[in-house]
C-alpha cells in the first residue's frame, strides 16, 4: 500500500494549527471498517492519534489532534495538530493498514517570528567622536535560533567586537542579545538584523548617533 506525505517539512507558527498531510489510494469497494490508521512520533513511537474498526479512537497527544473524518474514505489520512508548540517539532509517522500495509514520515518544523529589536546604548550621554560605545540589540520570543548581523550606515558588515547570546525560555522560544562595541565617528548609524532562518524573516533595529558632542536624552 503506497502512503504519500510531503517531502518538505511542514512549517507551522507557534500557536497556530498545522496539517500533516498523509494520503493513500483506496481500492474500489473500500470501507472505513477495513481501515487501521495510526499516527505516532517517529523517534519515540509514542501514539498520537488512531482510527480503527470504523471509529476515530481519538487523540493520545494532549487532546490537540484530529483527523478529517469526512475525507478518510477518499484516502485522506491527514492529521490536524492544534495550537502548535515548540515541543511538537519533529517527525510524525502515518501508518495505514487495510489489507496491505504502508507508512511514511512527515516532518514538522516549528517557527516563531522574532520581535522588532530594541536598541540600547552604554554610555548613552555626553558621547564624543572617538568614544567607545556598547550597542545592545535585543529581540525576543523567536524560534528557532536566530542569526544576528550588524552593519554601519553604508551597509558595510560589522563583524569584529560582536558578542551574541541566546537563551531559551520555558516554552522553548529564544531571546537573543547581541552586543557591538564600536568606536564612534562624527556621525554614525548602526543597524542590527535578526534573521529567522526558517521563516526567512528579518527583524531590523537601528540607532543613529549624530552631533558633536553627542548627547542623549
Amino acid at each position: 500500500l503506497e502512503v504519500q506525505v510531503p517531502e518538505d517539512p511542514v512549517v507551522a507558527l507557534v500557536g497556530t494549527d498545522a496539517t500533516l498531510c498523509c494520503s493513500f489510494s483506496p481500492e474500489p469497494g473500500f470501507s472505513l471498517a477495513q481501515l487501521n490508521l495510526i499516527w505516532q512520533l517517529t523517534d519515540t513511537k509514542q501514539l498520537v492519534h488512531s482510527f480503527a474498526e470504523g471509529q476515530d479512537q481519538g487523540s493520545a497527544y494532549a487532546n490537540r489532534t484530529a483527523l478529517f473524518p469526512d475525507l478518510l474514505a477518499q484516502g485522506n489520512a491527514s492529521l490536524r495538530l492544534q495550537r502548535v508548540r515548540v515541543a511538537d517539532e519533529g517527525s510524525f509517522t502515518c501508518f495505514v493498514s487495510i489489507r496491505d500495509f504502508g507508512s511514511a514520515a512527515v516532518s514538522l518544523q516549528v517557527a516563531a517570528p522574532y520581535s522588532k529589536p530594541s536598541m540600547t546604548l552604554e554610555p548613552n550621554k555626553d558621547l564624543r567622536p572617538g568614544d567607545t560605545v556598547t550597542i545592545t540589540c535585543s529581540s525576543y520570543r523567536g524560534y528557532p535560533e536566530a542569526e544576528v548581523f550588524w552593519q554601519d550606515g553604508q551597509g558595510v558588515p560589522l563583524t569584529g567586537n560582536v558578542t551574541t547570546s541566546q537563551m531559551a525560555n520555558e516554552q522553548g522560544l529564544f531571546d537573543v542579545h547581541s552586543v557591538l562595541r564600536v568606536v564612534l565617528g562624527a556621525n554614525g548609524t548602526y543597524s542590527c538584523l535578526v534573521r529567522n532562518p526558517v521563516l526567512q524573516q528579518d527583524a531590523h533595529g537601528s540607532v543613529t548617533i549624530t552631533g558633536q558632542p553627542m548627547t542623549f536624552p
Epitope: E145, P157, T159, T164, S165, A168, R195, P197, V198
Partner: antibody, heavy 122, light 108 residues
Framework: EVQLLESGGGLVQPGGSLRLSCAAS????????MSWVRQAPGKGLEWVSG?????????YYADSVKGRFTVSRDNSKNTLYLQMNSLRAEDTAVYYC??????????????WGQGTTVTVSS | EIVLTQSPGTLSLSPGERATLTCRAS??????LAWYQQKPGQAPRLLIY???TRAAGIPARFRGSGSGTDFTLTISSLQSEDFAVYYC??????????FGGGTKVEIK
C-alpha cells in the same frame, strides 16, 4: 552516509598556528549549525566554538579560545574550519567537529568526526 | 555560564546490573539536556536529547529523565558494550554549550 572527517592536526610549538578542516558529506551542510569540541588527554569534553548556518554567519567561542581561534565555513565546499593562533600547551587535545541533530538549531550533536589530534609542545 | 555537575565520578557495576547516573545544573535548563556515551579512542555518541528522548538507534535500556536542574540517565541492565564514559550537555543558554565532567561506568 552522513559523515564528518577532520584533518589538519599535528605538532606545533607554543605561539604557533594550525588550521583544522572538517569535510562534511551525506547531508545538506548549509542547513546545519556546526561545532568544534575538544578533549584534552584524560579529560572531559569541552565545547570550543560553533557557527550558524549562513556563509559568514554568527560565530561563537568559549572564553578560553576567544581572540585566538576563528571558526568559519564554506558551504560551497561543505567544509568547516578552525583557525587556531597563539597556541598554548593547554590547547593540546583531540578536536572533534560535530553536527547538530536538527537543521537551523544549536542543540545536541548527533554526528561527530573521528577527531584530529593537536599537540602544542616545544 | 551554566555549570553541569555529574555524579558519581566512577560507577563500578557488573553486567546485568542497573546503572543510575545523575547530572545537576547550576540553574534551570528546562529539558534542554542531552546525554552522550564515549568509549576509549572513539568520538562521543548521542544517546538522549530533550532530557528523555532516545536518539535514533539507541536501545530502550537507556532512559533519560528529569527537568530543571536535576537529571538522571538510567541503564536498566548493563551490557558489556555499555561500559564507557557518559557526559551530559546543556543547550538552553549559549554560548557556551557546556558539558558535565563525565561519569565512568566500569566493570566491577
Amino acid at each position: 552516509e552522513v559523515q564528518l572527517l577532520e584533518s589538519g592536526g599535528g605538532l606545533v610549538q607554543p605561539g604557533g598556528s594550525l588550521r583544522l578542516s572538517c569535510a562534511a558529506s551525506g547531508f545538506t551542510f548549509s542547513d546545519y549549525y556546526m561545532s568544534w569540541v575538544r578533549q584534552a588527554p584524560g579529560k572531559g569534553l569541552e565545547w570550543v566554538s560553533g557557527i550558524s548556518i549562513s556563509y559568514g554567519g554568527n560565530a561563537y567561542y568559549a572564553d578560553s579560545v576567544k581572540g585566538r581561534f576563528t571558526v568559519s565555513r564554506d558551504n560551497s565546499k561543505n567544509t568547516l574550519y578552525l583557525q587556531m593562533n597563539s597556541l598554548r600547551a593547554e590547547d593540546t587535545a583531540v578536536y572533534y567537529c560535530g553536527r547538530d541533530r536538527s537543521p537551523y538549531q544549536y542543540r545536541s550533536m548527533d554526528v561527530w568526526g573521528q577527531g584530529t589530534t593537536v599537540t602544542v609542545s616545544s | 555560564e551554566i555549570v553541569l555537575t555529574q555524579s558519581p565520578g566512577t560507577l563500578s557495576l557488573s553486567p546485568g546490573e542497573r546503572a543510575t547516573l545523575t547530572c545537576r545544573a547550576s540553574q534551570s535548563v528546562g529539558d534542554f539536556l542531552a546525554w552522550y556515551q564515549q568509549k576509549p579512542g572513539q568520538a562521543p555518541r548521542l544517546l538522549i536529547y530533550g532530557a528523555s528522548t532516545r536518539a535514533a538507534g539507541i536501545p530502550a535500556r537507556f532512559r533519560g529523565s528529569g527537568s530543571g536542574t536535576d537529571f538522571t540517565l538510567t541503564i536498566s541492565s548493563l551490557q558489556s558494550e555499555d561500559f564507557a564514559v557518559y557526559y551530559c550537555q546543556q543547550y538552553k543558554n549559549w554560548p557556551p554549550l557546556t558539558f558535565g565532567g563525565g561519569t565512568k561506568v566500569e566493570i566491577k
